[in-house]
Interface confidence: low
C-alpha cells in the first residue's frame, strides 16, 4: 500500500489486486484526510485504462451509475453519507476485467485525487497425471504425461525422476476464455528395468500455496526377459532330487511355461511342473541342454541351461540318486 | 413470480398533478432499484427517473427535475411517481420497471391523459 | 444526452426471414445497451442485456452484438410471434436513452 501523503488528502489503494476468473474481487481505495483537513467529496469515480467513459460513479446526489449494473457494486459508498471508501466490487470476473484502473475522488477545495490499481485474473488449474503404457521401442516415447487445465497465468510443470528422461511441454486454450491448459509428456526410451518405477510431476501456479506433487507409476510392456536357476554345476550321481525354476520377468505377466531339451521332448527323469522342472535321481551320467520357454501377450522368449549330472568321487555323499 | 402491479388510468387537467403507485411482489423491495418510463401513444420510451428503496437516493431525467418525486413506502414494497405541474405532452403510458441496469420487469403501465 | 437512433423505424419481413435491426448510440456506451420487445398493448420485455446477452427464457433465435456505438439486434429466423416493435436503451450514462424504435411487421 503507498504511504499516505502528509498536509494533503491521498486516495489509498493497493498497487496490485487479484481475482479468480468467475469469482468476485473487491477493488479497495479509500480516500485519506488528514486531521486538520476539510474536504468536500462530490463523486467517486472508477474508469478503466484505455476505455472511454467511467465504468462507475457514485454522485453524492444521484447516487451510483455503473457502466454494468450487473456486475459492479460500491461496497460502502451510501447516499447521504460522507464518501471516503470508493471500494468497488466487481462479480463474475472475466479475463477481459484484467487490467489498470483508476479510482479517483472529486474533492472540494482539493480537487480531484486518484490512483491506479492493477485487477490480475487469475484461474486455479486442476491437474491431472497418468501413465503412458508403452511397449518396448528403442526411441524415446511419452512415458508419463501430466496436464494442468484452465490456469490463468499457465502453470509451470516440472518433473522430477532418477531415470533421466526428457520433458516436452506445451500449450493450448483452456476451457475458459483466457485460461490456458499446460500438457507435458516425460520422454524415455523404455526399458523393462523402468517397469513400475515412479516419476514425480510437480505443478506450480501463484494460486497454490505450494506445489502439487503428481506421482506416475510407469508401466513398460515386454516380452519375458527369461534365465533358469537351481543349478549350481555341481551335480552329482546319488545326488537327491533337485528343482530348476524357470525365471521370468514380463508385463503382462507370463501366460505359459515350456520345458523342452535342444534334442526336443524332455526326458523321463525331468518333470515339468509349471516354472519348475523337477530333475528325478538318474543312476547314470547325463548331459542335457534344458530350454524354458515363457510367453505373454507380446510373444515367446526363451533361456537355455546345459546340465551335467557327473559321477563323483566314491567318498563324496552329493549326487542325484535314487535312495 | 415478480410481479409490478400500477394503478389504474388517470385523467388529469393541465397544471394539476398525478401520483401513481406500482405494488411489487415476488422478490426483496429493497434490493433493486425501480425506475420509471413512459412512452407517449405510438412513440418511443423516455426515462424518468430512479429511486433506491432502501437508501432513498433518486436518480432524474433533468427534462422532468422539478415536477417529478419518486418515493417509496417500504412496508407496503410499493413505488410512486407524482409528476406536478402537468401539461397536454405528459399524456403517456407511465412504466415503473425494476432496474437491473437495463430493466427485467415492468409494470402493466398506467394511462395518463392531461386534457382540458 | 446520449441519443440511440434505430434503423428502420419500420420493416416487413416474411416467416423464416433474418432479420437485422441496428442501433447507433451518438457516443460511446462500450456495451451497455439493452434490447426489448414491445407487443401491442404490452409492456416492454427485456430481451438482450450487455449488448449480447440474452436473458433466460428467450428463444435463442435473438441474438445481440456490437460496442462502442453500432449495434444490432438479429433475429435469426422469423416467427409470427415475434410482430412486436424493438427498442434499443443505453445504460451508459444518465439519462437513460431509447432508441425510437423499429415497427415489425410480418408479411
Known amino acids: 500500500w503507498p504511504p499516505p501523503g502528509t498536509g494533503d488528502v491521498v486516495v489509498q489503494a493497493p498497487t496490485q489486486v487479484p481475482g479468480f476468473l468467475g469469482d468476485s474481487v473487491t477493488l479497495p481505495c479509500y480516500l485519506q484526510v488528514p486531521n486538520m483537513e476539510v474536504t468536500h467529496v462530490s463523486q467517486l469515480t472508477w474508469a478503466r485504462h484505455g476505455e472511454s467513459g467511467s465504468m462507475a460513479v457514485f454522485h453524492q446526489t444521484q447516487g451510483p451509475s455503473y457502466s454494468e449494473s450487473k456486475r459492479l457494486e460500491f461496497v460502502a459508498a451510501r447516499l447521504g453519507a460522507e464518501l471516503r471508501n470508493a471500494s468497488l466490487r466487481m462479480f463474475g470476473l472475466r479475463v477481459e476485467d484484467e487490467g489498470n484502473y483508476t479510482c479517483l475522488f472529486v474533492t472540494f477545495p482539493q480537487g480531484s485525487r486518484s490512483v491506479d490499481i492493477w485487477l490480475r485474473v487469475l484461474a486455479k488449474p486442476q491437474n491431472t497425471a497418468e501413465v503412458q503404457k508403452v511397449q518396448l521401442t528403442g526411441e524415446p516415447v511419452p512415458m508419463a504425461r501430466c496436464v494442468s487445465t484452465g490456469g490463468r497465468p499457465p502453470a509451470q510443470i516440472t518433473w522430477h525422476s532418477d531415470l533421466g528422461g526428457m520433458p516436452n511441454t506445451s500449450q493450448v486454450p483452456g476451457f475458459l476464455s483466457g485460461t490456458v491448459t499446460v500438457t507435458s509428456l516425460w520422454i524415455l526410451v523404455p526399458s523393462s528395468q523402468v517397469d513400475g518405477k515412479n516419476v514425480t510431476c510437480k505443478v506450480e501456479h501463484e494460486s497454490f500455496e505450494k506445489p502439487q506433487l503428481l506421482t506416475v507409476n510407469l508401466t513398460v510392456y515386454y516380452p519375458p526377459e527369461v534365465s533358469i536357476s537351481g543349478y549350481d554345476n555341481n551335480w552329482y550321481l546319488g545326488q537327491n532330487e533337485a528343482t530348476l525354476t524357470c525365471d521370468a520377468r514380463s508385463n503382462p505377466e507370463p501366460t505359459g511355461y515350456n520345458w523342452s531339451t535342444t534334442m526336443g521332448p524332455l526326458p523321463p527323469f525331468a518333470v515339468a511342473q509349471g516354472a519348475q522342472l523337477l530333475i528325478r535321481p538318474v543312476d547314470k551320467p547325463i548331459n542335457t541342454t534344458l530350454i524354458c520357454n515363457v510367453t505373454n501377450a507380446l510373444g515367446a522368449r526363451q533361456a537355455e541351461l546345459t546340465v551335467q549330472v557327473k559321477e563323483g568321487p566314491p567318498s563324496e555323499h552329493s549326487g542325484i540318486s535314487r535312495n | 413470480e415478480v410481479q409490478l402491479v400500477q394503478s389504474g388510468s388517470e385523467l388529469k387537467k393541465p397544471g394539476a398533478s398525478v401520483k401513481i403507485s406500482c405494488k411489487t411482489s415476488?422478490?426483496?423491495?429493497?434490493?433493486?432499484?425501480m425506475h420509471w418510463v413512459r412512452q407517449p401513444h405510438g412513440k418511443g420510451l423516455e426515462w424518468i427517473g430512479g429511486i433506491h428503496p432502501n437508501s432513498g437516493g433518486t436518480s432524474y431525467n433533468q427534462r422532468f427535475k422539478g415536477r417529478v418525486t419518486l418515493t417509496v413506502d417500504k412496508s407496503t414494497s410499493t413505488a410512486y411517481m407524482e409528476l406536478s405541474s402537468l401539461r397536454s405532452e405528459d399524456t403517456a403510458v407511465y412504466y415503473c420497471a425494476r432496474w437491473t441496469g437495463d430493466f427485467d420487469y415492468w409494470g402493466q403501465g398506467t394511462l395518463v391523459t392531461v386534457s382540458s | 444526452d446520449i441519443q440511440m437512433t434505430q434503423s428502420p423505424s419500420a420493416m416487413s419481413a416474411s416467416v423464416g426471414d433474418r432479420v437485422t435491426i441496428t442501433c447507433k448510440a451518438s457516443?460511446?456506451?462500450?456495451?451497455?445497451v439493452a434490447w426489448y420487445q414491445q407487443k401491442p398493448g404490452q409492456p416492454p420485455k427485456a430481451l438482450i442485456y450487455s449488448a449480447s446477452y440474452r436473458y433466460s427464457g428467450v428463444p435463442d433465435r435473438f441474438s445481440g452484438s456490437g460496442s462502442g456505438t453500432d449495434f444490432t439486434l438479429t433475429i435469426s429466423s422469423l416467427q409470427a410471434e415475434d410482430l412486436a416493435e424493438y427498442f434499443c436503451?443505453?445504460?451508459?450514462?444518465?439519462?437513460?436513452?431509447f432508441g425510437q424504435g423499429t415497427k415489425l411487421e410480418i408479411k
Open positions: 415476488g422478490y426483496t423491495f429493497t434490493e433493486y432499484t
Open positions: 457516443q460511446n456506451v462500450g456495451t451497455n
Open positions: 436503451q443505453q445504460y451508459q450514462s444518465y439519462p437513460y436513452t
